[in-house]
Interface confidence: medium
Amino acid sequence: KAMHVAQPAVVLANSRGTASFVCEYASPGKATEVRVTVLRQADSQVTEVCAATYMMGNELTFLDDSICTGTSSGNQVNLTIQGLRAMDTGLYICKVELMYPPPYYMGIGNGTQIYVIDPEPCPDSD
């Protein structure tokens, strides 16, 4: 079954290469277990950036080496992607799956265009 997922159209990463955005989903029921996946679309290629499964009311737990962190609040997930470079500029799509209890629901957002600008190197100082 499908559900709506909403996310901002555009986000600008900060000078440290960190971008944050909220992914919001229209939960048709009371899910207790939710899986959030961030996908990056460049041209026609879609790659998984990170994923986390969490229990409602608990923190999102990404893998230790993940570039993503996040928190949840109700039907909103606050996602932060770190370590971005200019070459990582692209469309970042939020996918939400309501894993438990049945029925299974899945929704995919329209994507957030994240712009990353590499900082200018500091000039040498005498």
């Epitope: 709506h4 909403a6 996310q7 919001e24 026609s44 039907n75 469309l91 329209n110």
Partner: antibody, heavy 118, light 107 residues
Framework: QVQLVESGGGVVQPGRSLRLSCAAS????????MSWVRQAPGKGLEWVAE????????YHSDTVTGRFTISRDNSKNTLYLQMSSLRAEDTAVYYC???????????WGQGTLVTVSS | DIQMTQSPSSLSASVGDRVTITCRTS??????LNWYQQKPGKAPKLLIY???RLHSGVPSRFSGSGSGTDYTLTISSLQPEDFATYYC?????????FGGGTKVEIK
């Protein structure tokens, strides 16, 4: 069955404001993103604005950004389009549409005509 | 914004003819391509969504195909009620954009 009924159109002078409404019924309004699409007389379709199911996010076309604001009241099952600083080129039939899960506008209202003329 | 080039802009056909309308997008849209039918003085109606899925209540003579940047709407056997204007629309990327329309007229 799904029904979308627009109202609020009419003749307005350039520079003035108007608010369109769209009353929705026959589905769970608060679970769907909604849009406004317009069609100038004898012309094609042009997307104007969209709002997420809860109203958290809204998006507007470049041609109306800063002048038009989309909003919704889920307790009243109603979608709105507040239009200000109206121009002659805003003259069109304005349609309210529901966006389904595969990004298609699956249901449309009958439209309401907005005429901007001095 | 993604540009939508729809062709032809108009065509004349007879009842029973096979009609094909094409839509080309300026960027890859991963199949988020929809087709609408509009009759004079009426609101558009959804025919095909996600490239090839038939909306409920739409006759099976309508079909859609395509991928990447090239998409097609086909009416296998034109009926009297099919004379109308047809629009393609993409929502692979914001903002959603429409083609210029194809008017199908009686020959």
């Amino acid at each position: 069955q799904v029904q979308l009924v627009e109202s609020g159109g009419g003749v307005v002078q350039p520079g003035r404001s108007l608010r369109l409404s769209c009353a929705a019924s026959g589905f769970t309004f608060s679970n769907y993103a909604m849009s406004w699409v317009r069609q100038a007389p004898g012309k094609g379709l042009e997307w104007v604005a969209e709002i997420s199911y809860s109203g958290t996010y809204s998006y507007h076309s470049d041609t109306v950004t800063g002048r038009f604001t989309i909003s919704r009241d889920n307790s009243k099952n109603t979608l709105y389009l507040q239009m200000s600083s109206l121009r002659a080129e805003d003259t069109a039939v304005y349609y309210c549409t529901r966006r389904d899960y595969d990004n298609e506008m699956d249901y449309w209202g009958q439209g309401t005509l907005v005429t901007v003329s001095s | 914004d993604i540009q939508m080039t729809q062709s032809p802009s108009s065509l004349s056909a007879s009842v029973g003819d096979r009609v094909t309308i094409t839509c080309r997008t300026s960027q890859v849209i991963t199949n988020y391509l929809n087709w609408y039918q509009q009759k004079p003085g009426k609101a558009p109606k959804l025919l095909i969504y996600y490239t090839s899925r038939l909306h409920s209540g739409v006759p099976s003579r309508f079909s859609g195909s395509g991928s990447g940047t090239d998409y097609t709407l086909t009416i296998s056997s034109l009926q009297p009620e099919d004379f109308a204007t047809y629009y393609c629309q993409q929502f692979g990327k914001r903002p959603p954009t429409f083609g210029g329309g194809t008017k199908v007229e009686i020959k």
